[in-house]
């Protein structure tokens, strides 16, 4: 028998979609061989309709696709806009159509149930509102209006104009009779339940002259939208539940094996700790719609997600919901990189941020994830140069190394910098990534003076000490501005006594400003790099003052007083309350997104980088 397995029978109705999953043994040959969906003809031949090699027949154009999940040994055929012509016998298989590695699937597309003549069909999702329209003749205007539900051969009264309300519909149904001249009454049912599904009868008057109208109410469980995202990627769930619940608390939950739905995040401030640092619920629009972004997708994030509205911020029957089935593909296009970057107080980190290499011109951003309320991510820096004020002199976004990666450098680290940061662009949102910065015990490897005052017109020499392990690295000095860090000429000055254990291998690289001008005031960085990969940096602020004493000024190694916890807030660099509001670009209309969950380390150039999951920003 064939090792391929799938549904033997699939039945649906016109206009619907089906998603047919076929299973195969995930051997390496099977994983990479062609997958197909074909229709069996009268001659016995099986005509390919869609394949994993990109072929789609004209009959399926724009309404079908085939997605392979090699790590699971499955592939999925999605077919939309079904018509009765799609009914027939099919095969899903591997290799070539005529070989035995296939499974027979019967697809039956029907028209839907037969209804009494003149029946009005109302198709509404569970939790939503329906308005049933009931016409009547003038002579029945003063008479009793009623709505019945047909159950088998009997009719059960649901509501009437004499103020009767069936207990099953209490607090969620109303009958409206318009003013004179309008020969129609309406019944509005809110917060529809699955049990409301069925055939209803409107009635005005009684006896042989009564007016009757049949209404077929189809209450649908929201069909889960299938979402396929890459491992380490990100996903955005767009949730539009309607104006009726615009002012009600919203939530996203994940269905668990016990049939209940665990809250992932809600607008009442609840958030599942498994999503810490990688989830945002954006503010609601006026129409009550909202979206939830999850980055750093893991295999265990797979499952069925529901968004909804309820005052408790969790799933309740009879309230509107939307559903998604999330699949996480392990054969990811998003590169593997560390999820944690470590740095020491006073030191620095260099974070590598991936982006879609096809979008080198896109704007790049870096933001700080904040968990308060629904989560937000105020931008700290962007490639056009904006840097939030309290990060002046210690944060820079560099386009290097390019070709799918940019670099963010943060120095003068304090314990306050620990947290989650997101890399993003204004392009492909699937390449959003999250990295956690951890501040660990230790000393910065690069030593620079804590505070320097230069004299106008004279010469200033700023030393930067680095340990022997950086001797093979390229050393540089650059002048920081909010558009980057402009490299300056510098020189190696041979041994220094700063690192006794390194003796003659200890190194010193100096920056000379000669003569000092007013324009020289500002932040300077000393750093190490290997090619286009940046390692550690150290920052020093240079203040410029009028000449007081003749002679040049040299900041000797002995004056390199950079205590690890010291952060000079000088010349307008002051700590201010972070007033950055959530950037709308984070939630611009977008397709389903993905981010590179594991992130590049702080000291990428460092020789003793640790595991692929964690990397130190300052090696000890």
């Amino acid at each position: 028998k064939s090792p391929v397995f799938g549904p033997q029978e699939v039945s649906s109705v016109e206009g619907n979609s089906v998603s047919i999953k076929c299973y195969y043994p995930p051997t390496s040959v099977n994983r990479h061989t062609r997958k197909y969906w074909c229709r069996k003809g009268a001659s016995g031949r099986c005509i390919t309709l869609v394949s994993s090699e990109g072929y789609v027949s004209s009959n399926y154009a724009g309404r079908a696709n085939l997605t392979n999940f090699p790590e699971n040994g499955t592939f999925v055929v999605n077919i939309a806009q079904l018509s009765r012509d799609d009914s027939g016998h099919y095969k899903c298989g591997l290799g070539i159509n005529s070989r035995g590695l296939s499974f027979d699937v019967s697809l039956e597309v029907s028209q839907g149930p037969e209804l009494p003549n003149g029946t009005e069909v109302y198709t509404v999702d569970v939790g939503r509102t329906v308005t049933i329209k009931c016409p009547f003749k003038t002579e029945n205007a003063p008479k009793t209006k009623a709505l019945y539900k047909k159950i088998g051969q009997t009719s059960v009264l649901v509501i009437d104009s004499r103020n009767y309300v069936n207990p099953n519909y209490k607090d969620r149904i109303r009958l409206r009779i318009p003013g004179t001249g309008q020969l129609i009454f309406t019944v509005v049912i809110d917060r529809l339940r699955l049990s409301d599904h069925g055939l209803y009868l409107c009635q005005a008057g009684d006896g042989s002259n009564r007016d009757e109208k049949n209404a077929d109410l189809q209450v649908l469980e929201p069909e889960p939208e299938l979402v396929y995202e890459d491992l380490r990627g990100s996903v955005t769930f767009h949730c539009a539940l309607g104006l009726e619940v615009a002012n009600v608390a919203k939530f996203l939950c994940r269905v668990n094996s016990r049939e209940t739905c665990d809250v992932v995040i809600n607008t009442l401030g609840k958030r599942d700790s498994a999503f810490e640092g990688r989830i945002l619920l954006n503010p609601q629009d006026k129409d009550g719609s909202f979206s939830v972004v999850i980055t750093g997708l893991r295999k265990e994030d797979e499952g069925r997600y529901l968004c909804g509205a309820h005052s408790d911020g969790q799933l309740q029957e009879g309230w509107p919901i939307q559903a998604w089935q999330l699949f996480v593909n392990e054969e990811s296009t998003i590169p593997r990189s560390p999820t944690v970057v470590k740095g020491v107080a006073g030191g620095s980190v260099a974070v590598l941020c991936p982006y879609n290499p096809k979008e080198s011109q896109s704007l790049k951003y870096w933001c700080l994830w904040e968990g308060a309320q629904n989560g937000r991510c105020p931008l700290l820096v962007e490639s056009q140069g904006l840097v939030q004020e309290q990060y002046e002199g210690r944060l820079s976004l560099l386009q290097e190394p390019g070709n799918g990666t940019f670099t963010v450098i943060l120095n003068q680290l304090t314990t306050q910098d620990a947290g989650f940061y997101w890399c993003l662009t204004n392009g492909d949102t699937r390449w959003r990534t999250t990295v956690e910065i951890k501040i660990i015990e230790g000393e910065p490897n690069l030593k620079v003076p804590g505070n320097v005052t230069a004299v106008l017109g004279e010469t200033l020499n700023i030393p930067c000490h680095f340990p022997c392990k950086f001797s093979s690295y390229e050393k540089y000095w650059c002048k920081w501005s909010n558009t980057g860090c402009q490299t300056l000429p510098s020189q190696d000055e041979g041994p220094s006594e700063a690192f006794v254990n390194c003796d003659e291998n200890s190194r010193l690289v100096s920056l000379t400003l000669n003569p000092v001008t007013r324009a020289d005031e500002g932040w300077y960085w000393c750093g190490v790099k290997q090619g286009h990969f940046y390692g550690e940096t150290a920052a020093v602020y240079v203040a410029v003052e009028e000449k007081k004493v003749a002679g040049s000024r040299y900041v000797s190694p002995a004056k390199a007083d950079a205590a690890p916890d010291e952060k000079v807030l000088d010349s307008g660099v002051r700590e201010i309350e972070n007033k950055a509001i959530q950037d709308p670009r984070l939630f611009a209309e977008e397709k389903v997104v993905a981010d590179t969950g594991d992130q590049a380390g702080g000291s990428r150039a460092s020789v003793d980088s640790s595991s692929s999951e964690e990397q130190g920003g300052s090696s000890k």
């Epitope: 397995f5 039945s11 069909e223 668990n256 049939e259």
Partner: nanobody, 126 residues
Framework: EVQLVESGGGLVQAGDSLRLSCAAS????????MGWFRQAPGKEREFVAT??????????YYADSVKGRFTISRDNAKNTVYLRMNSLKPEDTAVYYC?????????????????WGQGTLVTVSS
């Protein structure tokens, strides 16, 4: 929590038919996979048939050993799933268990199903 109660088992002759029912109560509207498994004396529990649904679309899966003889169906209004068993054979003798799940990764795998009934015994004599 979902409760599943099976019924319809019994003693029949080879070649006869039986219809098993599985009624789900306490069901939230997220359940959309229900299946039948069976366990013969001294053997492991094995997959028989599963029905998965999404809106008005149904997907029916069968084990090779029952294909063409057994039919799985559901009645949404009654929250009940049925297994119609025709042309029964002595080797179909087993305790039949109903199972339910919210997510269908592979219908044949027991650990996909979080909720199980107590089982109903089907005995087919030759």
């Amino acid at each position: 929590e979902v409760q599943l109660v099976e019924s319809g088992g019994g003693l029949v002759q080879a070649g006869d038919s039986l219809r098993l029912s599985c009624a789900a109560s306490g069901r939230t509207f997220t359940t959309y996979v229900m299946g039948w498994f069976r366990q013969a004396p001294g053997k492991e529990r094995e997959f028989v048939a599963t029905i998965a649904w999404s809106g008005s679309t149904n997907y029916k899966y069968y084990a090779d050993s029952v294909k063409g003889r057994f039919t799985i169906s559901r009645d949404n209004a009654k929250n009940t799933v049925y297994l119609r068993m025709n042309s029964l054979k002595p080797e179909d003798t087993a305790v039949y268990y109903c199972a339910a799940s919210t997510v269908l990764t592979d219908p044949r795998r027991l650990n996909e199903y979080a909720n199980w009934g107590q089982g109903t015994l089907v005995t087919v004599s030759s």
